[in-house]
């Protein structure tokens, strides 16, 4: 499955689109800064087999549409540009599934790292808590915007390896 | 490697305008701010201002503010600092420095080589 | 604005030597504090951010303690390329600002 040629360009849009997301200057909310725990070592891409290190992407991108899915979210960032980034996320999760069917039988190893997907789902948690206890002010949903442009910037930096390993 | 290479030392006279730039290499220009640090001879760092590359958004100081402008061109990758009309008391080591943003990252983890502004008449 | 004092503001020091530099914010900063360090002639360089945080590629000797309003930078055995002068920036909110800076000098 080549999945950066399908994907890699999604990615790049999915970013331009949370860029244009701010609503307000993040230089009054450096105070709002917070340790999220970005799973770095699961972006690593070393001790992944491709069809786990695709699961940990879906994973992130899922967990992604949910944090935005939400009714606080959908009060804070513009309409027009939450209905592209779904698109751009529901490409990427259809991509990637695809990808995922084509790797079935391919590897020995399990399609799923079990432990890496928790790893994930807990980073999302301590955004979720975060956003939470700032009660969804617009300065918290800001850091959480540039947290998240984060992750998409390092999981691409993963796609570009997995399409190196090919 | 990341780097960020200003441009080369300037001399110039009271009243004059000047433009100093800053190119940032080996990473994503957007995604970092760019601080800029006067320092005058002998003395301490003293922070003047800082943009956001990607939409040119930008902060100064009290003590700068009206006094320079801080800009960028996102598709050359560069910063500048800039002034209309420069004064005697300008002359000084301007270093340029990036910032993660609200990122949880280190600040100021890679600066510029300096540049020297000599203002004299 | 936030004001940082250092002190002190020099200090002479020999190698082998536990150096200790103190900063304090003018109000609570939580851990917002980076340290720099800078050589005559060079950019300064990022020795510890948030407070404790080892900035890649410095050496283990280097530490950062300290949160609200009072911190300090250790260095547990001076060596002789640690003779520079020292600064602490908050980086809790702008206007950002530096200390005055300590300079460490050879006894």
């Known amino acids: 499955c080549d999945l950066p040629q399908t994907h890699s360009l999604s990615n790049r849009r999915t970013l331009m689109i949370m860029a244009q997301m701010g609503r307000i200057s993040p230089f009054s909310c450096l105070k709002d800064r917070h340790d999220f725990g970005f799973p770095q070592e699961e972006f690593d891409g070393n001790q992944f087999q491709k069809a786990q290190a695709i699961s940990v992407l879906h994973e992130m991108i899922q967990q992604t549409f949910n944090l935005f899915s939400t009714k606080d979210s959908s009060a804070t960032w513009d309409e027009t540009l939450l209905d592209k980034f779904y698109t751009e996320l529901y490409q990427q999760l259809n991509d990637l599934e695809a990808c995922m069917m084509q790797e079935v039988g391919v590897e020995d190893t399990p399609l799923m790292n079990v432990d890496s997907i928790l790893t994930v789902r807990k980073y999302f948690q301590r955004i979720t808590l975060y956003l939470t206890e700032k009660k969804y002010s617009p300065c918290a949903w800001e850091v959480v915007r540039a947290e998240i442009m984060r992750s998409f910037s390092l999981s691409a930096n993963l796609q570009e390896r997995l399409r190196r390993k090919e | 490697e990341v780097q960020l290479v200003q441009s080369g030392a300037e001399v110039k006279k009271p009243g004059e305008s000047l433009k100093i730039s800053c190119k940032g290499s080996?990473?994503?220009?957007?995604?970092?701010?760019i601080g800029w640090v006067r320092q005058m001879p002998g003395k301490g760092l003293e922070w003047m201002g800082i943009?956001?590359?990607?939409?040119?958004?930008?902060a100064y100081s009290p003590s700068f503010q009206g006094q320079v402008t801080i800009s960028a061109d996102k598709s050359i990758s560069t910063a500048y600092l800039q002034w209309s009309s420069l004064k005697a008391s300008d002359t000084a080591m301007y270093y340029c420095?990036?910032?993660?943003?609200?990122?949880?990252?280190?600040?100021?983890?890679?600066w510029g080589q300096g540049t020297l502004v000599t203002v004299s008449s | 604005d936030i004001q940082m004092t250092q002190s002190p503001s020099s200090l002479s020091a020999s190698v082998g030597d536990r150096v200790t530099i103190t900063c304090r914010a003018s109000?609570?900063?939580?851990?917002?504090l980076n340290w720099y360090q800078q050589k005559p002639g060079k950019a300064p360089k990022l020795l510890i951010y948030?407070?404790?945080s080892l900035q890649s590629g410095v050496p283990s000797r280097f530490s950062g303690s300290g949160s609200g309003t009072d911190f300090t930078l250790t260095i547990s055995s001076l060596q002789p390329e640690d003779f520079a002068t020292y600064y602490c920036?908050?980086?809790?909110?702008?206007?950002?600002?530096f200390g005055q800076g300590t300079k460490v000098e050879i006894k």
């Open positions: 920036q908050q980086s809790y909110d702008f206007p950002l600002t």
């Open positions: 943009i956001d590359p990607s939409d040119s958004d930008t």
């Open positions: 420095a990036r910032h993660p943003g609200l990122n949880w990252a280190p600040d100021f983890d890679y």
């Open positions: 080996g990473y994503s220009f957007t995604s970092y701010w």
């Open positions: 109000q609570s900063i939580d851990g917002s």
């Open positions: 948030f407070a404790s």
